[in-house]
Interface confidence: medium
C-alpha cells in the first residue's frame, strides 16, 4: 500500500478520509486506498478499440477514437462548440459558448442539440450517432465574459446517453491531479483547420504539450489566471481553433485510461509561434462538478 500522509490540497483523499503520498492514484489499476475508493467509479476513459480545434495542424481522428467528444449545434447554425461526455446525463463545455451574442440566445438550452458518437459533421444520421436536446446549462458562477476566467459550463442532457463503442465518458481528474509541464495531451474538435478558415467535417485530433505556467503568463501577459493553462508548442503549428471551444483536452494516464485535463477556451489566433492555446484547468473544478451533477 502507498504511504498515508497528512491531507493537503495536493494530496489525494480516499473515501475514508485518509490521504495518499502517491500522485494521481485514481483509476490507475492499483488499489492505493485501503478502502479501494481510488479505483471506484472508473467506468470511464477507455476506448472500445486500440490502434496505434479548431484543430490546426492535426489529423483526422479514427471513428470511435474519442467517444466522449460531443458536437453542440445551435438552432439553424450548425456546429458551434465542443463538449465532453462525463456521465450518461452530463457534458462539460466552455461557458463562453453559452453567452447570448448578436441576437441569438445561446444561454437557452432549447436552442441547442448535442450529437454524441459523431465522426463526420455531414453524417449526423449515421449509425451510432446519438442526438440529444439540452435540459439545462450551468455556467460557472464566476465566469467572466471579459477575461474568460472560470470558462467552464455543465450541460444536462434531456435524455441520457446510451454507452456504446462510439459513446463513452471521459474520466474526470481529482482536484489533486497534476498534468505536468511537458506532458503530451490530445486536443480534438471540428473547429477551423486554419485561423480564419472553415470548420472541419471529420473530427480532428492534434497532440500538444502542457506549457509551464510561468512561461504561459509571460507569453500572454495580464491574461492568464490560475484557472487557465497553456497547451501547445512555442513553435506553433498545432493548436485548437475557433469551433473547438468547449471540447476536451484528453490525457492518457496510468493504465492507459484517459482523463480530461482541460476545456478548450481561447487563444491569440491559432497555431501561432509563441501563442499557445489557452484551456480551462479541469482538476480545480472537480468539487464544483460533483456539487452540480453528482458525478
Amino acid at each position: 500500500k502507498v504511504n498515508v500522509v497528512t491531507c493537503t490540497k495536493h494530496t489525494y483523499r480516499c473515501l475514508n478520509g485518509l490521504c495518499l503520498s502517491k500522485g494521481n492514484p485514481e483509476c490507475d489499476g492499483k488499489e492505493d486506498c485501503s478502502d479501494g475508493s481510488d479505483e471506484k467509479d472508473c467506468d470511464c476513459g477507455l476506448r472500445s478499440f486500440t490502434r496505434q480545434a479548431r484543430v490546426v495542424g492535426g489529423t483526422d481522428a479514427d471513428e470511435g477514437e474519442w467517444p466522449w467528444q460531443v458536437s453542440l449545434h445551435a438552432l439553424g447554425q450548425g456546429h458551434i462548440c465542443g463538449a465532453s461526455l462525463i456521465s450518461p446525463n452530463w457534458l462539460v463545455s466552455a461557458a463562453h459558448c453559452y453567452i447570448d451574442d448578436r441576437g441569438f440566445r445561446y444561454s437557452d438550452p432549447t436552442q441547442w442539440t448535442a450529437f454524441l458518437g459523431l465522426h463526420d459533421q455531414s453524417q449526423r444520421s449515421a449509425p451510432g450517432v446519438q442526438e440529444r436536446r439540452l435540459k439545462r446549462i450551468i455556467s460557472h458562477p464566476f465566469f467572466n465574459d471579459f477575461t474568460f476566467d472560470y470558462d467552464i459550463a455543465l450541460l444536462e442532457l434531456e435524455k441520457p446517453a446510451e454507452y456504446s463503442s462510439m459513446v463513452r465518458p471521459i474520466c474526470l481528474p481529482d482536484a489533486s491531479h497534476v498534468f505536468p509541464a511537458g506532458k503530451a495531451i490530445w486536443v480534438t474538435g471540428w473547429g477551423h483547420t486554419q485561423y480564419g478558415g472553415t470548420g472541419a467535417l471529420i473530427l480532428q485530433k492534434g497532440e500538444i504539450r502542457v506549457i509551464n505556467q510561468t512561461t504561459c503568463e509571460n507569453l500572454l501577459p495580464q491574461q492568464i489566471t490560475p484557472r487557465m493553462m497553456c497547451v501547445g508548442f512555442l513553435s506553433g503549428g498545432v493548436d485548437s481553433c475557433q469551433g473547438d471551444s468547449g471540447g476536451p483536452l484528453s490525457s492518457v494516464e496510468a493504465d492507459g485510461r484517459i482523463f480530461q485535463a482541460g476545456v478548450v477556451s481561447w487563444g491569440d489566433g491559432c497555431a501561432q509561434r509563441n501563442k499557445p492555446g489557452v484551456y480551462t484547468r479541469l482538476p480545480l473544478f472537480r468539487d464544483w462538478i460533483k456539487e452540480n451533477t453528482g458525478v
Epitope: H96, C97, D100, D101, D145, F146, K275
Partner: antibody, heavy 122, light 108 residues
C-alpha cells in the same frame, strides 16, 4: 440598422456629476457588450469603461476608476455612465460603442454613436 | 499600460497614391489584438480592421492590415477622396485598452 444615440452631456462645474445615456436600437442590445470611449477636443481617443452583455462584469480605465460607474438596463435598451467628481480633464465628447463578439476574444469597437459633449469648467 | 505610437503624425498624399501608416507598441500584447479606425471631422470613428488583418464588414479591400509583435501597419492601396481622414490604431490584448494618437491623412 444599428443606432446608438448618446444624451446627457452638457456643462458642469468641477466636482459635479453627470449621467450619460445611450439609447440603442436596430439590434438585440442585451446580446452586446458595450463601452464608453471619449475624445478630448482636438485630441485622440481614450477608452473609458466597458460592461458585459449581462451587466455582471465591468472594466474601467484607471483615470476614471472610483469616479465613474457604467451600467445598463437591458429592458430599456439603454447604457449609462454615471460620472461623479468631474475634473477639467474629463472634458470630451463621449461615445458609446458596441464591443465585438467576446466569443471571438475581441475587445474592439464595431459600432459607435455620434457622441455627446461633456464640458467641465467653472 | 501599453503605449501605441503612430507615425507619421501627418501624411500628405494625392488621390490614387498608396498610404502606409505605422503603429508601434511599447510592448508585445498579443499579435491578433489590434484594430484600426477611421475618423472624419465631426463624425464618430469607424472600425476598419480588427485582429490586425481582418477587414470589418463593408470595408473596401483597398484597406489592409498587417504586422505582429510590436509593429503594425495599415495600408490603403489607392487613396480615394473619401479616405482623407484621421486613422487610429487600438490594442485590446492588454487592459487598459489603448489607442494611438492618430495619423492624419491629408490631400497634398
Amino acid at each position: 440598422e444599428v443606432q446608438l444615440l448618446e444624451s446627457g452631456g452638457g456643462l458642469v462645474q468641477p466636482g459635479g456629476s453627470l449621467r450619460l445615456s445611450c439609447a440603442a436600437s436596430g439590434f438585440t442590445f442585451s446580446s452586446y457588450a458595450m463601452s464608453w470611449v471619449r475624445q478630448a477636443p482636438g485630441k485622440g481617443l481614450e477608452w473609458v469603461s466597458a460592461i458585459s452583455s449581462s451587466g455582471v462584469n465591468t472594466h474601467y480605465a484607471d483615470s476614471v476608476k472610483g469616479r465613474f460607474t457604467i451600467s445598463r438596463d437591458n429592458s430599456k435598451n439603454t447604457l449609462y455612465l454615471q460620472m461623479n467628481s468631474l475634473r477639467a480633464e474629463d472634458t470630451a465628447v463621449y461615445y458609446c460603442a458596441t464591443i465585438a463578439s467576446i466569443a471571438l476574444r475581441g475587445y474592439y469597437f464595431d459600432y459607435w454613436g455620434q457622441g455627446t459633449l461633456v464640458t467641465v469648467s467653472s | 499600460e501599453i503605449v501605441l505610437t503612430q507615425s507619421p503624425g501627418t501624411l500628405s498624399l494625392s488621390p490614387g497614391e498608396r498610404a502606409t501608416l505605422s503603429c508601434r507598441a511599447s510592448q508585445t500584447f498579443g499579435s491578433s489584438y489590434l484594430a484600426w479606425y477611421q475618423q472624419k471631422p465631426g463624425q464618430a470613428p469607424r472600425l476598419l480592421i480588427y485582429g490586425a488583418s481582418s477587414r470589418a464588414t463593408v470595408i473596401p479591400d483597398r484597406f489592409s492590415g498587417s504586422g505582429s509583435g510590436t509593429d503594425f501597419t495599415l495600408t490603403i492601396s489607392r487613396l480615394e477622396p473619401e479616405d482623407f481622414a484621421v486613422y487610429y490604431c487600438q490594442q485590446y490584448g492588454s487592459s487598459p485598452w489603448t489607442f494611438g494618437q492618430g495619423t492624419k491623412v491629408e490631400i497634398k
